[in-house]
């Protein structure tokens, strides 16, 4: 058992049929010695008397807010939450597995540049009685500071019969060094509590591995005289690290016909312009990726050929 | 050339070769479904590799002030990885495929280190740790880890040379 916050405790339970559970001793926070009774949640049923109450915590019915009283007056409370371990694995019932980039991905994080700022998000189908706290650091044995803002509800989607809620948080490394080669990963830890269930989720990554630039900006077409060719030009996204001579991007230019089945023409270039053939009803798209490290491509920026 | 006396390297040549190194490092170990090698335990194996750190002067300002510190750091790393790629971690079982880019990668690391430090000049080099995994599967895992680490190292080196070629070339 350990304290999550003042008077809120997490009981770690091996979860299997007929498991013995955990013996927990609660102590009433009072100088009083006698005439003390204990109740659970809103029930008035007396569970025991005396300054301490010993309970065997086996299931969610044993968790909740324990209150000690004397003569109708509340003396103190303790809230017990459960953290389930099944077959040696902590439960992950609260958040949804996003399965990207691999199974058991509950927290996904992305960075638009090397500034040390990143965003993480997670999904749940639970709407009410749900709380989160978020912590982050660089490294775990001698952690360096990362400051996270508020975890906010960033999207709601309907998925079949279920509503899905997306929460996101922005974090910033306190002393970021954009040009350095990271040797210690960023750690992100999310504590989630749903009703009386406690779970924790972690993600560990290097900023370089979660880089996803914004799409190129100011994508423009300039027809070339007496030709079906056009010059496509674009610029680095505003959010990308500077100077661009150091933090360089590479680009993929794609010509796509109206039908998805039509063959796509693709060119790769380090420049911010390219010459392509513009087919009728086609569109031209450009996306960006770090030139020297194969992290994610940006989303496409597109313009119609016409 | 980045001789210890402090003259400039052939920035454009270094840029081209370091960009080639990036390509080779990724073709030697493409990112297979974000295989997270940090989960595989065994941290100490790649903790000893030289990293380009914050105080090494490899940022744009540091390069403008005095590129020698950074170039020396890069040189140390190139020699270190060149030795690792020539060690029994890569030459032992399981054998690399004949068309594996690791051979080219090894040669290019040597090429870039020689561009930075011609014969007869000597910068300190870092001691290579004695990593002799006994099992083929340990060797395979170590190869992956080394290549992942090398990808990060050469990315920073390539940025340095690209920026140098664009802003510091005579």
């Amino acid at each position: 058992i350990w304290e999550l916050k003042k008077d809120v405790y997490v009981v770690e339970l091996d979860w299997y049929p007929d498991a013995p559970g955990e013996m927990v001793v609660l102590t009433c926070d009072t100088p009083e010695e006698d005439g003390i009774t204990w109740t659970l949640d809103q029930s008035s049923e007396v569970l025991g008397s005396g300054k301490t109450l010993t309970i065997q915590v086996k299931e969610f019915g044993d968790a909740g807010q324990y209150t000690c009283h004397k003569g109708g007056e509340v003396l103190s409370h303790s809230l017990l939450l459960l953290h389930k371990k099944e077959d040696g694995i902590w439960s992950t019932d609260i958040l949804k597995d996003q399965k990207e980039p691999k199974n058991k991905t509950f927290l996904r994080c992305e960075a638009k540049n090397y500034s040390g700022r990143f965003t993480c998000w997670w999904l749940t189908t639970i709407s009410t009685d749900l709380t989160f706290s978020v912590k982050s650091s660089r490294g775990s044995s001698d952690p360096q500071g990362v400051t996270c803002g508020a975890a906010t509800l960033s999207a709601e989607r309907v998925r079949g019969d279920n509503k899905e809620y997306e929460y996101s948080v922005e974090c910033q490394e306190d002393s970021a060094c954009p040009a350095a080669e990271e040797s210690l990963p960023i750690e992100v830890m999310v504590d989630a509590v749903h009703k009386l269930k406690y779970e924790n989720y972690t993600s560990s990554f290097f900023i370089r591995d979660i880089i996803k630039p914004d799409p190129p900006k100011n994508l423009q077409l300039k027809p070339l005289k007496n030709s079906r060719q056009v010059e496509v030009s674009w610029e680095y996204p505003d959010t990308w690290s500077t100077p661009h001579s150091y933090f360089s991007l590479t680009f993929c230019v794609q010509v796509q016909g109206k039908s998805k089945r039509e063959k796509k023409d693709r060119v790769f270039t380090d420049k911010t312009s390219a010459t392509v053939i513009c087919r009728k009803n086609a569109s031209i798209s450009v996306r960006a990726q770090d030139r020297y490290y194969s992290s994610s491509w940006s989303e496409w920026a597109s313009v119609p050929c016409s | 050339r980045a001789v210890p006396g402090g003259s400039s390297p052939a920035w454009t040549q270094c840029q081209q070769l370091s960009q080639k190194l990036c390509t080779l490092a990724w073709s030697a170990h493409p990112l297979v479904g974000h295989m997270d090698l940090r989960e595989e335990g065994d941290e100490e194996t790649t903790n000893d590799v030289p990293h380009i750190q914050c105080g090494d002067g490899c940022d744009p300002q540091g390069l403008r002030d005095n590129s020698q510190f950074c170039l020396q750091r890069i040189h140390q790393g190139l020699i270190f990885y060149e030795k690792l790629l020539g060690s029994d971690i890569f030459t032992g079982e399981p054998s690399l495929l004949p068309d594996s880019p690791v051979g080219q990668l090894h040669a290019s690391l040597l090429g870039l280190s020689q561009l930075l430090q011609p014969e007869g000049h000597h910068w300190e080099t870092q001691q290579i740790p004695s990593l002799s995994p006994s099992q083929p599967w340990q060797r395979l895992l170590l190869r992956f880890k080394i290549l992942r680490s090398l990808q990060a190292f050469v990315a920073v080196a390539a940025r340095v040379f690209a920026h140098g070629a664009a802003t510091l070339s005579p």
Epitope: K6, Q65, T128, L130, T131, S133, A151, T152 | -
Partner: nanobody, 125 residues
Framework: EVQLVESGGRLVQAGGSLRLSCAAS????????MGWFRQAPGKKREFVAI????????NYANSVKGRFTISRDNAKNTIYLQMNSLKPEDTAVYYC??????????????????WGQGTQVTVSS
């Protein structure tokens, strides 16, 4: 120093309506769940209603569902409890609570970090 100040409590006839307000100062709670709890004489403090940081998710105790509505105005750092069809059993001191956590909030009062002094609501029959 964080302060939550409740207002709007008074004596009202059964079937009547009241609107409670809770103004927060000392920090903003625009991303944090806030809620109302109540305590009747000789009883434990019980959950009434909670609202998420952006106001999009609300949760009510079964005893007040359909009669009470919780809302918030983040620009004013204030939450409200509109109480309709009041019953004598709604008589209690109503407390405003704010959490330092995120999400949609908890029905357990120990999960809240900041509390107001309370405002008395008395419903006469």
């Amino acid at each position: 120093e964080v302060q939550l100040v409740e207002s709007g409590g008074r004596l009202v006839q059964a079937g009547g309506s009241l609107r409670l307000s809770c103004a927060a100062s000392g920090r903003t709670f625009d991303s944090n769940p806030m809620g109302w709890f109540r305590q009747a004489p000789g009883k434990k403090r019980e959950f009434v209603a909670i609202i998420s940081g952006n106001g999009g998710i609300t949760n009510y105790a079964n005893s007040v569902k359909g009669r009470f509505t919780i809302s918030r105005d983040n620009a004013k750092n204030t939450i409200y409890l509109q109480m309709n069809s009041l019953k004598p059993e709604d008589t209690a001191v109503y407390y405003c609570a704010a959490s330092g956590l995120y999400g949609s909030g908890s029905v357990y009062d120990l999960m809240y970090d900041y509390w107001g002094q309370g405002t008395q609501v008395t419903v006469s029959s």
